[in-house]
């Protein structure tokens, strides 16, 4: 029965003469008169079994003492640590020529576990032992007793087991502990690789080269490989392992991403949290679900936030000349997170006083630059036919419309064709500028072609460039345009109504808003 | 879902000592669980955690000193060779499953070291 | 190991009035936004208010709010009550390591 003793992780210890409860019974050689085993105290008052023998008056001594048969284990260099304590023999009077200072050390490999006696000529020689701390008769007056260590190793080993036996020549010893061991590389856990228990080569020069195995939830990037050194450290870990998608390194394993956490890939890279509008309900997810109404495209990482699709264009525009029609509208107010945003033109032709009577315009009509995904916020459409009735609408799509098509995405404008509108607006004036405001004036189009019914003003700041404007209709020819920002310019155009629809906007008026209140006049061109 | 806290007592330096916390109404194996202390009078102080797969971390100040462990319902800490710097409340504390924080705490059980 | 500190250790104020506490990381916790706010009153454990730095735990009234990103936190509680005097701790994950602020003593006047 062997009592617990604490060693380093890198050590295996095959024998500890200290752990042994009882008697050690080991053979010795003669069986009396040389070692002989005696039970001591160590320093925690703890009895110990020792070998002691103290022929030192005798020439020619020949004592062996064996230890029973120790298993190897696999291992091709084992280490013998001995714990030995040597009488100076300048302490002892009258044992000049016979008294010695060292003993021998040997082994013998076997496969035998039950050899019961002492061929001295089957073992081989490890070394001889000398004290680096011998002891006078002062030392044992006052209870010193100096403890020597000495560490041998041995190998290789190739047989089942071996034995160890010590041979005095004629000194004064004990054996206060012989212990055992061999080394090994301890599991460890680098780079996500787990690399077993690896028992060290057989000369202190070797590496053995081991292959480790990616822990839980993960998978190699680079093989990893890692070399056991004869002293029972890893060195020199090459490749690694990646925590699978859905999970992160913590603390050297892949643990599941948390609740509302994602990742997609097998990386290095920690869990994220679910991007906006999105979310997920259990460990481990490698995507987030969208909330209800957003999307996410087909070419969406899963990193980006949750979408949905834009609201309808804003500001439709429709300019009817003939069988002609231009149309101009203004970007969605939410374009539903995204930057992918499009427009389609739908046309239908609609029966005389029913609208319901509507039916697709067909391939004859022509739209430029085209009828679908449009980047800008005007189409023209032309080879309609005369007298007839138009509906268009505007369809405000993205790279998630396709997941929630709805009327809410569209505008849309009934127009008829044939009818000549008026023709363009030829002077446009500034008459009175102040801080906020701008009053307007402008002449009747040379060419009404009926009765006006109102006019529209189409006004927005100069370094907006269109982008995003404003309509002001009023049926008398002039008006106020309030609400302005100070020192600011401002491009305005007018167009003139009647029941054919509307004309051809005005040259553009440029208008810079004062600081003072002044009243200039415009010529059509430039004011400021 | 609680958690109790137990084994703490007045001590001898250098004497082990094991504190358990008890868990009910959720399975050890769904969870981490960490040991936060909190000496008289000072702020709170993380020691370590054990992940559900049974291994476990420290905080750098706490390697060597501390041991914890569980069964299927107990998570134990073991204080390995107490000084008088360890005289504490110890709490035990449930990390959330949806943040990186404990959402669950024990009510503590105090340690006193004194010779 | 990242280091949590919180400038003040005690703040006070009157009943209605509000308090704001600072937590400042020496490293950018996990995500940017792992922190999350405990009251502690003597002889009690903690209890969570916040999580991930702005999301109010479950049972806690609204008006205590926390927000910051990255080194940087606060804790605000508004319309302060008596019930509120109590110590306030932050927490913060980075690379396994949780690491508490020293903690802040609200004086309720």
């Known amino acids: 029965v062997t009592g617990s003793r604490v060693y380093p992780a890198n050590e295996v210890t095959l024998l500890d003469s200290r752990s042994v409860q009882g008697e050690l019974g080991w053979i010795a050689s003669p069986l009396e008169g040389g070692w002989e085993e005696v039970s001591i105290m160590d320093e925690k008052n703890t009895p110990i079994r020792t070998y002691q023998v103290c022929n030192v008056m005798e020439p020619s001594q020949n004592n062996w003492l064996r230890t029973d048969w120790i298993t190897r284990e696999g291992a091709q260099r084992v280490y013998i640590e001995i714990k030995f304590t040597l009488r100076d023999c300048n302490s002892l009077p009258g044992v000049m020529g016979t008294c010695k200072e060292t003993f021998n050390l040997y082994y013998y490999e076997s496969d035998n576990d039950k050899e019961r006696f002492i061929r001295e000529n089957q073992f081989v020689k490890i070394d001889t032992i000398a004290a680096d701390e011998s002891f006078t008769q002062v030392d044992i007056g006052d209870r010193i007793m100096k403890l020597n260590t000495e560490i041998r190793d041995v190998g290789p080993l190739s047989k089942k087991g071996f034995y160890l036996a010590f041979q005095d020549v004629g000194a004064c010893i004990a054996l206060v502990s012989v212990r055992v061991f061999y080394k090994k590389c301890p599991l460890t856990v680098r780079n996500l690789a787990q690399f077993p228990d690896t028992i060290t080569g057989a000369d202190t020069s070797s590496l053995v080269e081991v292959r480790g195995s990616c822990v839980n939830n993960s998978e190699e990037k680079d093989v990893p490989k890692m070399y056991c050194g004869a002293d029972g450290e890893w060195l020199v870990p090459i490749g690694n392992c990646l925590c699978n998608a859905g999970h992160e390194e913590r603390s050297g394993e892949c643990q599941a991403c948390k609740i509302g956490y994602y990742k997609a890939l097998s990386t290095d890279a920690t869990c994220a949290k679910c991007p906006p509008h999105s979310y997920s309900v259990w460990e481990g997810a490698t995507s987030c679900t969208c909330d209800r109404g957003f999307f996410r495209a087909d070419n969406d990482a899963a990193s980006m936030p949750c979408t949905r699709p834009p609201s309808a264009p804003l500001n439709l525009i429709s300019n009817v000349n003939e069988t002609s029609v231009n149309l101009e509208w203004s970007s969605p107010q939410n374009t539903g997170g995204r930057q992918d945003i499009s427009y389609n033109v739908v046309c239908k032709k609609c029966g005389a006083g029913d609208p319901s009577k509507c039916r697709p315009c067909g391939s004859g009509v022509h739209y430029t630059p085209q009828q679908n995904g449009l980047k800008t916020t005007k189409v023209s459409i032309t080879d309609l036919l005369a007298h007839t009735n138009y509906t268009f609408e505007i369809w405000a799509v993205n790279g998630v419309s396709k997941y929630n098509p709805s009327p809410d995405q569209s505008v849309s404008v009934t127009v008829t064709t044939n009818q000549a509108a008026p023709s363009s607006i030829a002077l446009v004036q500034a008459k009175e500028v102040t801080r906020y405001s701008v009053a307007l004036a402008w002449l009747e189009p040379d060419r009404p072609n009926g009765v006006i019914l109102e006019y529209e003003v189409k006004y927005y700041e100069k370094d907006q460039n269109e982008r995003s404007y404003r309509i002001v209709r009023t049926a008398a020819r002039n008006t106020d345009i309030k609400g302005l920002n100070p020192l600011t310019s401002y491009v305005f155009h007018v167009r003139a109504r009647t029941a054919a629809g509307y004309g051809d906007f005005s040259e553009p008026l440029e208008v810079t808003t004062n600081t003072v209140p002044s009243r200039i006049i415009g010529d059509g061109a430039n004011s400021t | 879902q609680s958690l109790e806290e137990s084994g703490g007592r007045l001590v001898t330096p250098g004497t082990p000592l094991t504190l358990t916390c008890t868990v009910s109404?959720?399975?050890?194996?769904?969870?981490?669980m960490s040991w936060v202390r909190q000496a008289p009078g000072k702020g709170l102080e993380w020691i370590g955690i054990i992940y559900r797969s049974g291994n476990t971390y420290y905080a750098n100040w706490a390697k060597g000193r501390f041991t914890i462990s569980k069964t299927s319902t107990t998570v134990d800490l073991k204080i390995t060779s107490p000084t008088t710097e360890d005289t504490a409340t110890y709490f035990c504390?449930?990390?959330?499953?949806?943040?990186?924080?404990?959402?669950?705490w024990g009510p503590g059980t105090l340690v006193t070291v004194s010779s | 190991d990242p280091v949590l500190t919180q400038t003040a250790s005690s703040v006070s104020a009157a009943v209605g009035g509000t308090v704001t506490i600072n937590c400042q990381a020496s490293q950018s916790v996990y995500g940017n936004n792992e922190l999350a706010w405990y009251q502690q009153k003597p002889g009690q454990p903690p209890k969570l208010l916040i999580y991930?730095?702005?999301s109010l735990a479950s049972g806690v009234p609204s008006r205590f709010k926390g927000s910051g990103s990255g080194t940087e936190f606060t804790l605000t509680i508004s319309d302060l009550e008596c019930a509120d005097a109590a110590t306030y701790y932050c927490?913060?994950?980075?690379?396994?390591?949780?690491?508490f602020g020293g903690g802040t003593e609200v004086v309720v006047k």
């Open positions: 991930t730095a702005s």
């Open positions: 504390a449930r990390e959330s499953s949806t943040f990186y924080g404990m959402d669950l």
């Open positions: 109404g959720f399975s050890l194996s769904s969870y981490h």
């Open positions: 927490l913060g994950y980075k690379s396994d390591d949780y690491t």
